[in-house]
């Protein structure tokens, strides 16, 4: 049997070697013109796929195989020319130098060439199946695209429309956003940058202390001068006093000493009849030393010893130990009545605390203990609280149990640092705790995210400075 | 855009007082605070009060209190600075802004073009 | 109230050069800070805010840096419309402004 064989010479073209008996014969066959080879990476099912196309991706996969088509084609053409032209010469050939068995083969090798031919036409109308397949899937797309297109450009203008609309509500909401996250990053910034500065302040103004406790003794030297000047002072005073009496007296024998009415506290002065608030003359406990003090004849059945006052930022309440100890201020605006006096005063009998707190909204609240008293200056006046009720948290707001008093030069806290100094302000600082009433006063708009202010935390949180506080102190018994 | 528009220049005599506009535009007039700048030729810059267009609520500086009022007209988006008892020293450019903050107190970010006030007997 | 001092109070510079510009604040002021640029005739211009942050169609050759007392304004390259007058303000502790700093051609 004839034995038929394909390959490639060293120049890239097809050969078809046809081998029958002795005799062995060699068609050189024409290569397609930029087409693919079978390496390519061109599949022919590829053009099968039920996946949508990207429309960019199908129109160029279409050109690619109207190129093949056409270059399929015209090496057909090619084909069927050559073929035919060497089949005249062969045949002429054959007739005039071979036998008629040799006819025979040549016939043979036609008939296996046109089979080919045969074969590559049919799988060429397989693939212009194929394609004509894939354009219809194509146009079936690009009209769905379409469909779809049209549909999602009337859907954009109907959000563009909507979105023009939310765009002036979302301009003003976008600005509130980034201000406030702006204020956010600053805000964590500046609490670090704070903590910083703080550690460097506190260095500072340890050295400051050592030069102050200098001047301190100096001033404490200077004032047992005084005191005694004084003591020697108010005996005089005493002595003339006796003998304007005695030579009153004497004078006039009918006329009665007057009785001198003094009042301990604010309750005294209600029960006395004085029933308007005001600033009162009170004395201090087992003495004759007066302090003044504002009265609350008014709320919650009056009575009320005003002990603090925080309103308006008018008063600068970073005093000295001395200061926090005898009173500072206005009764009638900001103050601080005095430690010594409360101390005194609250160790007599039981007295209740009201601390009355006002924020910057609108809002009140209030903390009440049932039993107050503040220990005496050997232990810091150190405070004692018991029995919490009230609205403006449920958890003390003044660290329990109670701390000694601080001051920025008198520091009594639990603290590495020096509360008083970092914070500003005397107050019962723990470490440093959550509460100073007695911090720097800050206005509206400027009162949050401010580690000194005027701080409840129970109430208002770590970093809200309020508006107005008022601490007042009534006899239990009222 | 945002806009402040302030009332023109005022010519006054000292112990009188004078009122000073400031028309907003371009945002909501109740939003933000605004503030009042005043200004010295050749000097630097003073603050002295503010108001909050939604409440009426006024916070002065301390060396201004009880000589200037603010207030405000919410239908015409409009804050005013009333300054009373004029001296020769009240004779600088003031300035309305608009303070940027929301919830707390931020930086200028719109200016009016100013309003020159002159107080000479 | 808080204290705002800037310096140098002129500054001579060329253009392309850079400027570096200082405010000091008598107390901590977090990052409460801002800068203004005043030309003549014209109302202040917010430049830089929360010490660093620029505000809305500032060129970013203006760069400002720090926190609690000391804050620095730069311009990286001055071009000609940057010579001006410049402010610092705090807003941490009621609102107080520096005097000012005068950028003029060398």
């Known amino acids: 049997y004839n034995n038929f064989r394909k390959s490639m010479d060293s120049i890239g073209k097809k050969q078809y070697q046809v081998q029958h008996g002795s005799c062995s014969y060699t068609f050189l066959l024409p290569e397609m013109d930029n087409c693919r080879s079978s390496s390519s990476p061109y599949v022919s099912n590829a053009v099968q796929r039920d996946a949508p196309l990207e429309y960019d991706d199908s129109v160029q996969r279409l050109q690619v195989l109207e190129n093949i088509m056409e270059n399929n084609t015209q090496w057909l053409m090619k084909l069927e020319n050559y073929i035919q032209d060497n089949m005249k010469k062969e045949m002429v050939e054959i007739q005039q130098n071979a036998v008629q068995n040799q006819t025979a083969v040549m016939i043979e090798i036609g008939t296996n060439l046109l089979n080919q031919t045969a074969e590559q036409t049919r799988k060429l109308t397989d693939v212009e199946a194929q394609v004509l397949n894939q354009t219809t899937r194509l146009e079936l797309q690009l009209l769905e695209h379409s469909l779809s297109t049209n549909k999602l450009e009337k859907q954009i203008l109907d959000q563009t429309s909507e979105i023009n609309k939310l765009q002036d509500k979302n301009s003003f909401l976008e600005k509130k956003v980034l201000a406030m996250e702006d204020k956010h990053i600053i805000q964590l910034q500046s609490i670090k940058e704070e903590k910083d500065q703080l550690q460097v302040l506190v260095s500072k103004q340890n050295s400051i202390i050592e030069e102050l406790e200098k001047k301190i003794v100096t001033a404490t030297v200077n004032n047992s001068v005084l005191q005694k000047q004084q003591h020697d002072l108010m005996e005089t005073v005493n002595n003339l006093l006796t003998m304007m009496s005695t030579s009153n007296s004497a004078k006039d024998p009918t006329v009665a000493k007057e009785e001198q009415i003094s009042f301990r506290d604010c309750a005294e002065v209600f029960k006395s009849g004085h029933t308007t608030n005001g600033i009162y003359t009170l004395t201090f406990p087992n003495s004759t030393e007066e302090i003044k003090a504002y009265c609350d004849m008014e709320a919650g059945g009056g009575g009320w010893t005003i002990i603090q006052r925080r309103e308006d930022g008018s008063v600068d309440f970073q005093r000295t130990w001395k200061e926090y100890k005898v009173g500072f201020g206005n009764p009638s605006g900001e103050y601080w009545l005095g430690n010594e006096f409360v101390s005194q005063l609250t160790n007599q009998q039981r007295y209740v605390l009201k601390i009355h707190l006002k924020d910057w909204e609108g809002n009140e609240a209030y903390s009440l203990y049932e039993h107050f008293y503040l220990s005496s200056e050997e232990l810091n006046y150190r405070i004692h609280l018991k029995g919490l009720t009230g609205t403006a948290g449920k958890i003390s707001s003044i660290s329990q149990p109670g701390n000694d008093f601080s001051t920025k030069d008198g520091d009594n806290d639990k603290c590495i640092c020096k509360c008083s100094q970092m914070l500003t302000g005397g107050w019962w600082f723990d470490a440093c705790g959550p509460s100073n009433l007695n911090g720097m006063y800050y206005p509206q708009r400027q009162n949050t995210n401010k580690f000194n202010g005027i701080k409840w935390y129970y109430w208002k949180g770590s970093g809200y400075s309020l508006k107005a506080t008022t601490m007042m102190i009534r006899p239990a018994d009222f | 855009q945002v806009q402040l528009v302030q009332s023109g220049a005022e010519v006054t005599k000292p112990g009188a007082s004078v009122k000073v506009s400031c028309k907003a535009s371009?945002?909501?007039?109740?939003?933000?605070?605004m503030y009042w700048v005043r200004q010295a030729p050749g000097q630097g810059l003073e603050w002295m009060g503010w108001i909050n267009p939604n409440s009426g609520g006024t916070n002065y500086a301390q060396k201004f209190q009880g000589r200037v009022t603010m207030t405000r007209d919410t239908s015409i988006s409009t804050a005013y600075m009333e300054l009373s008892r004029l001296r020769s020293d009240d004779s600088p450019v003031y300035y309305c802004a608009r303070d940027q903050g929301i919830a707390a107190a931020g930086p200028f970010d719109y200016w009016g073009q100013g309003t020159l006030v002159t107080v000479s007997s | 109230e808080i204290v705002m001092t800037q310096s140098p109070a002129t500054l001579s510079v060329s253009p392309g050069d850079r400027a570096t510009l200082s405010c000091r604040a008598s107390?901590?002021?977090?990052?409460?800070f801002a800068w203004y640029q005043q030309k003549p005739g014209q109302a202040p211009r917010l430049l830089i805010y929360g010490s660093s942050t620029r505000a809305t169609g500032i060129p970013a050759r203006f760069s400002g840096s720090g926190s609690g007392t000391e804050f620095t304004l730069t311009i990286s390259s001055l071009q000609s419309e940057d010579f001006a007058v410049y402010y610092c303000q705090q807003y941490h502790y009621w609102w107080t402004f520096g005097q000012g700093t005068k950028v003029e051609f060398k």
């Open positions: 107390q901590s002021v977090s990052s409460n």
């Open positions: 371009g945002y909501t007039f109740t939003a933000y605070h």
